[in-house]
Interface confidence: medium
Amino acid sequence: AILGRSETQECLFFNANWEKDRTNQTGVEPCYGDKDKRRHCFATWKNISGSIEIVKQGCWLDDINCYDRTDCVEKKDSPEVYFCCCEGNMCNEKFSYFPEMEVTQPTSNPVTPKPP
């Protein structure tokens, strides 16, 4: 392990489209990748009239936008679909929305996906 870096070995997995994509609906996903690459977790969700609807969660390949982010935070202002990535085991278990240049309450993840 590299000092000061939180290595990602597994992430929370969720796929709303699990039947068509032929995956589990929910679980823990081991993250694979080349040894010289960093690995991350991600989460994507929608906010439909204040209700959080998770789209996907899982492992994410080496991406500079995710480096050294211990928390999964979306910073884009009012995206259609929210996306965040982070480093560290299961760091995508909780995710939040903090748009840059605005003071807004975070949207935490209150949803526990039901097993299939």
Epitope: D21, C31, Y32, C59, L61, D63, E80, V81, F83
Partner: antibody, heavy 120, light 107 residues
Amino acid sequence: EVQLLESGGGLVQPGGSLRLSCAASGFTFSSYSMNWVRQAPGKGLEWVAGINYNGGYTSYADSVKGRFTISRDNSKNTLYLQMNSLRAEDTAVYYCARSANWHDTALDYWGQGTLVTVSS
Amino acid sequence: DIQMTQSPSSLSASVGDRVTITCRASQSILSFVNWYQQKPGKAPKLVIYAATSRASGVPSRFSGSGSGTDFTLTISSLQPEDFATYYCQQSYNLPLTFGGGTKVEIK
């Protein structure tokens, strides 16, 4: 060095069968999902089928569903594509390609391809 | 299935030119887009993944941008070895789907 080497292509008559193989080396084969992608002569790329790291999940393009079967033998570091009821439109170069996760990831290494020609 | 529409289908450019290729998805795919380079008789090679990340060994003149439905591959200063066909691909949902390709030819 990651290497993927396809074999098994050739000339086959319509309605016939063929089994393609992809021998993998230079990485931990059993940790990666694998895919078959084809390219008809002078045309673009078409994803054919995918299989997750342990063979637990498979998925197919509608154009080959029910005719093609993807499988893998992790003890032999080999990926397979069994092609039955072949049609002229299946004529293409078939590539095997690696992906880190079963879903939402790039095809980061490709083999050199093997040509399948379906003709009478 | 998610359709990926690439434009232009071909373009002519000179060494040193800035080249931009666009790809539009039929629905939002967030950052789940990848770009490949293919030379005649060769296998495709990954150039950009996750919309903006350069694959190993890819020169810095290649960059990717976009999210949602609109994506761009840019070659800042075209080199002789860059003349090839480029494909976008979505990995948001199965089946994986590719754009029709953009052939970059020498002017």
